[in-house]
């Protein structure tokens, strides 16, 4: 019979990118296991990750049902084996997570430049519309399909021969910018959701430079 009492989880943290959403917590279990429950403000508590010794739980399947809802999770601690529980009167120990609204809080993943084409003094840069784990009628939706006009991109570009940077913005997945004919350019893009108060911008895409081995058209 063990002597280590069950302890409540702490540091409950949401980790979410493009709606792939994982709840993490501490501590690593010693003589205990966890079960996670998730709920909307108006909904019922649904158990996930039953009797696990992990300190994370993938809740994507639940939050993608309605990404504009606000979710709350809680982590229950149960004694493993014949260990005493510290819960009073048979009440299980649990800790609540912060609230999480996927639409407002999921990180936007690093964008990818799908292709670029130069024609004279115009350069067209296309950003790949990444798929999310949100489904509609059995089909995965793209970022653009989920966010619509709330999603924009910022292009940062410069001449290969210069360090002076310029920026352009778009509410679509394409940029059409004026360039000097015959010059090569380097550029990267960043996703942005201007209406947000947190996680407004993604990390920058890898920098692409024209005239390198990849060629001027990349799919």
């Amino acid at each position: 019979s063990g002597t280590t009492n069950t302890v409540a989880a702490y540091n409950l943290t949401w980790k979410s990118t493009n709606f792939k959403t994982i709840l993490e917590w501490e501590p690593k279990p010693v003589n205990q296991v966890y079960t996670v429950q998730i709920s909307t403000k108006s909904g019922d508590w649904k158990s996930k990750c039953f009797y696990t010794t992990d300190t994370e739980c993938d809740l994507t399947d639940e939050i993608v049902k309605d990404v504009k809802q606000t979710y709350l999770a809680r982590v229950f601690s149960y004694p493993a084996g014949n260990v005493e529980s510290t819960g009073s009167a048979g009440e299980p120990l649990y800790e609540n997570s912060p609230e999480f609204t996927p639409y407002l809080e999921t990180n936007i993943g690093q964008p990818v430049i799908q292709k670029y084409e130069q024609g004279g003094t115009k350069l067209k840069v296309t950003v790949k519309d990444s798929f999310t784990l949100v489904r509609k009628n059995g089909t995965f939706l793209t970022l653009r399909q989920v966010f619509g006009n709330d999603l924009g991109y910022i292009l940062t570009y410069r001449k290969s021969s210069s360090s002076g940077k310029k920026t352009a913005k778009t509410n679509t997945n394409e940029f059409l910018i004026d360039v000097d004919k015959g010059e090569n350019y380097c550029f990267s893009v960043q996703a942005v959701i201007p209406s947000r108060t947190v996680n407004r911008k993604s990390t920058d895409s890898p920098v692409e430079c024209m005239g390198q081995e990849k060629g001027e058209f990349r799919e």
């Epitope: 649904k46 039953f50 010794t53």
Partner: antibody
Framework: QVQLVQSGAEVKKPGASVKVSCKAS????????MHWVRQAPGQGLEWMGI????????VYAQKFQGRVTMTRDTSTSTVYMELSSLRSEDTAVYYC??????????????WGQGTMVTVSS | DIQMTQSPSSLSASVGDRVTITCQAS??????LNWYQQKPGKAPKLLIY???NLETGVPSRFSGSRSGTDFTFTISSLQPEDIATYYC?????????FGGGTKVEIK
């Protein structure tokens, strides 16, 4: 095919212990939780606890805490349930039952045939 | 512990009848409910999981539904081989708990 085969009936005296075995075959032993459920004569079903064969972690219903021990032997794909300090109320059929896949994680989709344990002086 | 109140405790119906069993949870358990069939002297058999999903190989005359904390198990057309005791089981909260069972007999 997937099956769970349990050890035979036992007759025990009050205060003694009993150890029931459950041998799994036809699936990857480590990938599914195993539960123990008992049923007293003419009564309903009662969940006793769960063991994760992968790491051997167990969780018991509070009612059995301190009296039950669930173990597993991965080399023979067998789980064991030992109940100590037996009393007459422990007379029951003891079942092992496999927890389902991730789709139905805590639904018991495969059951052993049951082991009758009689506690009598 | 979550109490699962199953009713009726027994019923008698004719072959071809529609049979309904209910299970009420003492608190919200989402759709984390399973239904089992147990024939005399045999181990239980899983019929329905997650309130309404039919286990592979189970005849389509068996079905399950949920309304809040009330769960319904239905046999659309009772067959002689359906004579058994039926149990509900919740798994949303520890410990897992069963209903008291409903014994179904043929008139």
């Amino acid at each position: 095919q997937v099956q769970l085969v349990q050890s035979g009936a036992e007759v025990k005296k009050p205060g003694a212990s009993v150890k029931v075995s459950c041998k799994a075959s036809g699936y990857t032993f480590a990938n599914y939780y195993m539960h123990w459920v008992r049923q007293a004569p003419g009564q309903g079903l009662e969940w006793m606890g769960i063991i994760n064969p992968s790491g051997g972690i167990t969780v018991y219903a509070q009612k059995f805490q301190g009296r039950v021990t669930m173990t597993r032997d991965t080399s023979t794909s067998t789980v064991y349930m030992e109940l100590s300090s037996l009393r007459s109320e422990d007379t029951a059929v003891y079942y092992c039952a496999r927890g389902g896949s991730k789709v139905a994680a805590l639904a018991f989709d495969i059951w052993g045939q049951g082991t009758m344990v009689t506690v009598s002086s | 512990d979550i109490q699962m109140t199953q009713s009726p405790s027994s019923l008698s119906a004719s072959v071809g009848d529609r049979v309904t069993i209910t299970c009420q949870a003492s608190q919200d358990i989402s759709n984390s409910l399973n239904w089992y069939q147990q024939k005399p002297g045999k181990a239980p058999k899983l019929l329905i999981y997650d309130a309404s999903n039919l286990e592979t190989g189970v005849p389509s005359r068996f079905s399950g539904s949920r309304s809040g904390t009330d769960f319904t198990f239905t046999i659309s057309s009772l067959q002689p081989e359906d004579i058994a005791t039926y149990y509900c089981q919740q798994y949303n909260f520890h410990p897992l708990t069963f209903g008291g069972g409903t014994k179904v007999e043929i008139k």
